[in-house]
């Protein structure tokens, strides 16, 4: 008597999550009677898929009709696959009796899972940092499956290289996560630069996602002071200017500082962007030469973005007042405070 | 090549817990059963139980009210929990894989730690 | 529990010769689909166990052809065609039918 044989033909399927898997299964004969089951996973700690004569299975379905008299067509088909129904599933002919005896099983079939990545996540630094310092950004991405995945970041469109990816778990398992740092190095233009980061998958059909950060929360461009003293006015009043340029955030605050003594405090708002998305702010103080006997030094203190204050001084001579003691600057001005403090 | 490596404390003092970590490199956690056996000084190897991919728990009767094993295949670990020892539960441990074959039986434990000596005592 | 037991427990070896080793269940190791759940384990001194023979007589993966199993049943030998030096150590026989797995209480082998 020719032994029966359980032939499960395909030693792997792939099925896209939400779509319905067919799993091949027949036998080389009739004899002896008894049921065929399906189970994922093998040994003590299987589960029972497909029972076709008995239970409740609301996912899996004969393909062909099993109470057909001389069925030999054991196929099953399971619906909305999750990527939680992946494994290695075998189907098994038992010989009728109390208890019915396993006999034989297939050689088992692999069901594996594609799954989409999900929208790719990424974050910045946690604190800024200025221009020629290195940040790292990290991306994550989960649920996918099969694990192979290509991960790419791009500054302004240019690939980044200094890049480490990590897919795990490094085994076999229903889905995947990726997760990879980029170190970024800033420059003072890079206000208005953007890091993406691209994921493409075999279940994204050439359409790869992409999550983006603005290097704009990563970096703080510190401002360049200029403190300068116009004209004298023939009421013998001097207009010094401090030019606080290319700084970024906005956030600002201006102290003057006469002979050490606070003059004015002030704080930048609603300043309008340079091309490069830093601001500059110009702030004026008019001194009264006539009311000092001595020279008065003015500084201007710079407290950027909760960092230590930067300080510029200027010392107003007193002794002779020529018409000219300083000239105008070129920088942009970009907001004006005069006030007479006499 | 599938290597196991156990970590944990190699003193226990009597009533506490045993916890033991099998970090599983070079393969996959999927389709295998992932095995604690020990063997106390001297003697012969003594099976405690094991954990399938799917989360399925198998423990020697003698050793349930006391044993959990779990996995945590984002590590690609599995732990053993012992609770109450006692200086008896002394023994070097072993994590292991066993193969699984198509049939309801199993396909030999083909793969071992190291071992880990744990001592109770006070 | 599946009982196994082993017999000799001590085995002086002649390198060159051949050895052998019983083993024997308390029930039978035999499935009903044909396949045998009886393993050979040998573990040197100071070493991990390492698995020598799965399904009573299939050799694993880069072990020697001198190791041979056979049996059926309850009853399984494991036969070494010539002992070599470094085949000392203590060799265990066990089921994977049914849980809990369990081991024979191991035969010592060592050079006489």
């Known amino acids: 008597e020719e032994e029966l044989q359980v032939i499960q033909p395909e030693k792997s399927v792939s099925v896209a999550a939400g779509d319905s898997a067919t799993l091949n299964c027949t036998v080389s004969s009739l004899i002896p009677v008894g049921p065929i089951q399906w189970f994922r996973g093998a040994g003590p700690g299987r589960e029972l898929i497909y029972n076709l004569k008995e239970g409740h299975f609301p996912r899996v379905t004969a393909v062909s009709d099993p109470t057909k008299r001389n069925n030999m067509d054991f196929s099953i088909r399971i619906s909305n696959i999750t990527p939680a129904d992946a494994g290695t599933y075998y189907c098994v002919k038992f010989r009728k009796g109390s208890p019915d005896v396993e006999l034989k099983s297939g050689a088992g079939t692999e069901l594996s899972v594609r799954a989409k990545p999900s929208a790719p996540v990424v974050s910045g630094p946690a604190v800024r940092a200025t221009a020629e310092h290195t940040v790292s950004f990290t991306c994550e991405s989960h649920g996918f499956s099969p694990r192979d995945i290509t991960l790419k970041w791009f500054k302004n469109g240019n690939e980044l290289s200094d890049v480490q990816t990590n897919v795990d778990p490094a085994g076999k398992s229903v889905s995947y996560s990726i997760r990879s740092t980029a170190r970024v190095l800033l420059t003072r233009r890079d206000v208005h630069s953007q890091v993406i980061c691209e994921v493409a998958h075999v279940t994204l059909q050439g359409d790869p996602l992409r999550g983006t950060a603005n290097l704009s929360e990563a970096i703080r461009v510190p401002p360049f002071l200029e403190v300068t003293q116009q004209s004298m006015r023939a009421d013998n009043q001097v207009n010094v200017t401090c030019q606080v340029t290319k700084f970024y955030p906005q956030r600002l605050q201006l102290t003057w500082l006469e002979n050490g003594n606070v003059s004015r405090t002030e704080m930048a708002s609603a300043l309008p962007e340079n091309k490069d998305g830093t601001y500059n702010w110009t702030s004026w103080l008019l001194v009264n030469v006539s009311a000092h006997r001595d020279d008065v030094k003015l500084t201007c203190q710079v407290e950027h973005d909760g960092q230590p204050a930067v300080n510029k001084s200027f010392s107003v001579k007193v002794s002779a007042h020529p018409k000219e003691q300083g000239s105008n600057t070129a920088a942009e001005n970009t907001g004006t405070n005069e006030r007479n403090i006499y | 090549q599938v290597q196991l490596q156990e970590s944990g404390p190699g003193l226990v003092k009597p009533s506490e817990t045993l916890s033991l970590t099998c970090t599983v490199s070079?393969?996959?956690?999927?389709?295998?059963?992932w095995s604690w056996i020990r063997q106390p000084p001297g003697k012969g190897l003594e099976w405690i139980g094991f954990?399938?991919?799917?989360?399925?728990?198998f423990y020697q009767s003698s050793l349930k009210s006391r044993v959990t094993i779990s996995l945590d295949t984002s590590k690609n670990q599995f732990s053993l929990k012992m609770t109450s020892v006692t200086a008896a539960d002394t023994a070097v441990y072993y994590c292991?894989?066993?193969?699984?074959?198509?049939?309801?039986?199993?396909?030999?434990?083909?793969?071992w730690g190291q071992g880990t000596t744990v001592t109770v005592s006070s | 529990d599946i009982v196994m037991t082993q017999s000799p427990l001590s085995l002086p070896v002649t390198p060159g010769e051949p050895a052998s080793i019983s083993c024997r269940s308390s029930?039978?190791?035999?499935?009903?689909?044909?396949?045998?759940?009886l393993d050979w384990y040998l573990q040197r001194p100071g070493q991990s166990p390492q698995l020598l023979i799965y399904?009573?007589?299939s050799r694993a993966s880069g072990v020697p052809d001198r190791f041979s199993g056979s049996g059926s049943g309850t009853d399984f030998t494991l036969k070494i065609s010539r002992v070599e030096a470094e085949d000392v150590g203590v060799f265990y026989c066990?089921?994977?039918?049914?849980?809990?797995?369990?081991f024979g209480q191991g035969t010592k082998v060592e050079i006489k």
């Open positions: 399904g009573g007589s």
């Open positions: 029930q039978s190791l035999l499935y009903s689909t044909g396949y045998t759940y």
């Open positions: 292991a894989r066993v193969r699984a074959y198509s049939g309801i039986g199993l396909d030999g434990t083909d793969v």
């Open positions: 066990g089921q994977a039918l049914q849980t809990p797995l369990t």
């Open positions: 954990i399938y991919y799917n989360g399925r728990t």
């Open positions: 070079g393969g996959s956690i999927r389709d295998y059963y």
